[in-house]
């Protein structure tokens, strides 16, 4: 992209290059042939995060507790507030405007990745040799009991939802 008539951090108005306002400040008046651009800081509840020529600052995001949100990082004059979800909840969308409870992994499935404030639980089917008999947002698939190591034999085979059942070996008389 070839360079434009005005340099970086400048804007063109009425055939003149004026300085943009720095992040955290809004435009009050454009420059003239004899005066510089006039900028003013955003108020406490507002921000602007780029070099700009905005005449109004943006309001900080409100983290609504009724939607399960809480403040993760307080906004400044240059940054917006970052919201996250309360414990046990995660963001419904990338913009995190509301939260929903983490899903549990049903029996036969284990937790592959525990949910965070911004991502839901990721479940995976228990592979052969593993099981989960609970509905849980935390529990991974557990390995079947090894009967051999207990000097026992398998009496009932395990499934993806149940452990094996071990029993004593039949003694030869």
């Amino acid at each position: 992209e070839p360079p434009t008539a005005c340099r970086e951090k400048q804007y063109l108005i009425n055939s003149q290059c004026c300085s943009l306002c720095q992040p955290g400040q809004k435009l009050v008046s454009d420059c003239t042939e004899f005066t510089e651009t006039e900028c003013l800081p955003c108020s406490e509840s507002e921000f602007l995060d780029t070099w700009n020529r905005e005449t109004r600052c943006h309001q900080h995001k409100y983290c609504d507790p009724n939607l399960g949100l809480r403040v993760q990082q307080k906004g400044t004059s240059e940054t917006d507030t970052i919201c996250t979800c309360e414990e046990g909840l995660h963001c419904m969308s990338e913009s995190c405007e509301s939260c929903v409870p983490h899903r549990s992994c049903l029996p036969g499935f284990g937790v592959k990745q525990i949910a965070t404030g911004v991502s839901d639980t990721i479940c995976e089917p228990c592979p052969v040799g593993f099981f989960s008999n609970v509905s849980s947002a935390f529990e991974k698939c557990r390995p079947w009991t090894s009967c051999e190591t207990k000097d026992l034999v398998v009496q009932q085979a395990g499934t993806n939802k149940t452990d094996v059942v071990c029993g004593p070996q039949d003694r030869q008389r």
């Epitope: 360079p3 434009t4 008539a5 340099r7 108005i13 009425n14 055939s15 290059c17």
Partner: antibody, heavy 116, light 107 residues
Framework: QVRLQQSGAELVRPGTSMRVSCKAS????????INWVKQRPGQGLEWIGI????????NYNENFKDKATLTADKSSNTAYMQLSSLTSEDSAVYFC?????????WGQGTLVTVSA | DIQMTQTTSSLSASLGDRVTISCRAS??????LNWYQQKPDGTVKLLIY???GLHSGVPSRFNGSGSGTDYSLTISNLEQEDIATYFC?????????FGGGTKLEIK
């Protein structure tokens, strides 16, 4: 005083290119932007583009992006507009104009006639 | 692009009259409306910049006003040397655009 002296009238053939010059005096050449404007009889004024003589940076009207090229020579305080692939539609008076405030100082205009 | 409209293409007035020429933009142009005078010999001069700023050397009988989308140029006490075509132009956003012009003639 501020003065923009443009090159003289030209008769050019269709399909060729030509260059209009605009020599600035009476002010710091690199401190002000230069605009170019086209005027055809009965068609009003059309802004072609704007040039920063200090940096060489430009902005063009989309309608002239493939038609006009704006440049400057700081050593001679001269701005140039190259017009390419000329057709009868390009027959017009072309003005160079120093910016700030607005289109503050105009050259006398250069009449370009495209004819076989 | 912003369209600039001068509804009156020609205007007749007598010397000494007060004349008003109007210009409308298709959207808000803040204050960035400029007025130009083109004499019959083709020379062009800036009269008013940014709605109401009188350019250096321009007589005080020229006055600009307006806001938003509606602007006007008033010439009080019309003189013979004011016979010309007057153009408005917006300098708010690219591409810069002009009105079609208003030709002022003497009755």
């Amino acid at each position: 005083q501020v003065r923009l002296q443009q090159s003289g009238a030209e008769l050019v053939r269709p399909g060729t290119s030509m260059r209009v010059s605009c020599k600035a005096s009476g002010y710091a050449f690199t401190n002000y932007l230069i605009n170019w404007v086209k005027q055809r009889p009965g068609q009003g004024l059309e802004w072609i583009g704007i040039l920063n003589p200090g940096s060489g940076g430009t902005n063009y009207n989309e309608n002239f992006k493939d038609k006009a090229t704006l440049t400057a020579d700081k050593s001679s305080n001269t701005a140039y507009m190259q017009l390419s692939s000329l057709t009868s539609e390009d027959s017009a008076v072309y003005f160079c104009i120093r910016g700030s405030p607005g289109f503050a100082y105009w050259g006398q205009g250069t009449l370009v006639t495209v004819s076989a | 692009d912003i369209q600039m409209t001068q509804t009156t293409s020609s205007l007749s007035a007598s010397l000494g009259d007060r004349v008003t020429i109007s210009c409308r933009a298709s959207q808000d142009i803040n204050i960035y409306l400029n007025w130009y005078q083109q004499k019959p010999d083709g020379t062009v001069k800036l009269l008013i910049y940014s709605t109401s700023g009188l350019h250096s050397g321009v007589p005080s009988r020229f006055n600009g006003s307006g806001s938003g989308t509606d602007y006007s140029l008033t010439i009080s006490n019309l003189e013979q040397e004011d016979i010309a075509t007057y153009f408005c132009q917006q300098g708010y956003t690219l591409p810069y655009t002009f009105g079609g012009g208003t030709k002022l003639e003497i009755k």
